[in-house]
């Protein structure tokens, strides 16, 4: 009974670096706590860029210097991602952990490509 | 160099208690759940326990349920088994080993052996 | 609990062969499986996760297939350190369970 975690394919993030995607998952178990972990994969290279865990029907809660920011609702999780720049353009891949009562169960999404562009700067104005 | 120092083992006596404990190095280990595997002699893998980064969750095998304690200490970087009430069948290489971001073992100590025996 | 099943047990090969490995799980385990090696008297090493993503530093000899409750690990041209018994392990789960081995020694 392995857990299957749905992302979209494709994200663009907004002129001011935001960008939101939900990640939804198909619990194998009756969970209550959960953690849901971002991973981004650019260049072979993975680092976390943030995780949070929460009790189930409870807000998600990012640490308060995290870009994330997130709301869950049953089996799905609106993650919200700010402060972008174009370098930051790469796969986002979400994470699920069900972390209690036992047993543990482990999902991870294919990943959503979120691309950044940064906005063209205003030219002066006589 | 990322890793994964084991200490601790050594031989006791069925019934006895021994705590073994692994020193991390070369990575922020309060960003990384931890486990124990064990390997009897001539014999295959079989996990032990598991701990959070937090050790907010910690997960064992039936086997060692009750008998066993894991727990981590962030601030010196390292990893602990308490192990009591031993048995001749937990004669075993200890091995701690980290999980990666994707979930497998990505990182593993040396092991330190474990003898139980009268 | 989640019981891997690897066969054989042994395989026979000589240096420059192909290693067909395979390992067989009791449920789904989805992509949730990696592969280690290991010599005599070291640690595990990580070869595979996910099923078929090397791990770093991993020469590319080695490659893993499959998802579900069927996985193969492929040694196209064996070298003389890949001699080694090769564990899989299923990590989507609690209790985190491993094979049983295949050891792949020099016919």
């Known amino acids: 009974k392995a857990m299957h975690v749905a992302q979209p394919a494709v994200v663009l993030a907004s002129s001011r670096g935001i960008a939101s995607f939900v990640c939804e998952y198909a619990s194998p178990g009756k969970a209550t706590e959960v953690r849901v972990t971002v991973l981004r994969q650019a260049d072979s290279q993975v680092t976390e860029v943030c995780a949070a865990t929460y009790m189930m029907g409870n807000e998600l809660t990012f640490l308060d210097d995290s870009i994330c920011t997130g709301t869950s609702s049953g089996n799905q999780v609106n993650l919200t991602i700010q402060g972008l720049r174009a370098m930051d353009t790469g796969l986002y891949i979400c994470k699920v952990e069900l972390m209690y009562p036992p047993p543990y169960y482990l999902g991870i999404g294919n990943g959503t490509q979120i691309y950044v562009i940064d906005p063209e700067p205003c030219p002066d104005s006589d | 160099e990322v890793q994964l120092v084991e200490s601790g083992g050594g031989l006791v006596k069925p019934g006895g208690s021994l705590r073994l404990s692994c020193a991390a190095s070369?990575?922020?280990?309060?960003?990384?759940?931890m486990n124990w595997v064990r390997q009897a002699p001539g014999k295959g893998l079989e996990w032990v326990s598991s701990?959070?980064?937090?050790?907010?969750?910690?997960y064992y095998a039936d086997s060692v349920k009750g008998r066993f304690t894991i727990s981590r200490d962030n601030a010196k970087n390292s990893l602990y088994l308490q192990m009591n009430s031993l048995r001749a069948e937990d004669t075993a290489v200890y091995y701690c080993?980290?999980?990666?971001?994707?979930?497998?073992?990505?990182?593993w100590g040396q092991g330190t052996m474990v003898t139980v025996s009268s | 609990e989640i019981v891997l099943t690897q066969s054989p047990g042994t395989l026979s090969l000589s240096p420059g062969e192909r290693a067909t490995l395979s390992c067989r799980a009791s449920q789904s385990v989805s992509r949730y499986l990696g592969w280690y090696q290991q010599k005599p008297g070291q640690a595990p090493r990580l070869l595979i996760y996910?099923?078929?993503t090397r791990a770093t530093g991993i020469p590319d000899r080695f490659s893993g297939s499959g998802s579900g409750t069927d996985f193969t690990l492929t040694i196209t041209r064996l070298e003389p350190e890949d001699f080694a018994v090769y564990y899989c392990?299923?990590?989507?789960?609690?209790?985190?369970?491993f094979g049983q081995g295949t050891k792949v020694e020099i016919k």
């Open positions: 996910g099923a078929s």
């Open positions: 070369g990575f922020t280990f309060s960003s990384y759940s």
């Open positions: 080993a980290r999980v990666g971001l994707f979930g497998p073992f990505d990182i």
């Open positions: 392990q299923q990590y989507g789960s609690s209790p985190w369970t």
């Open positions: 701990i959070s980064s937090s050790s907010s969750y910690i």
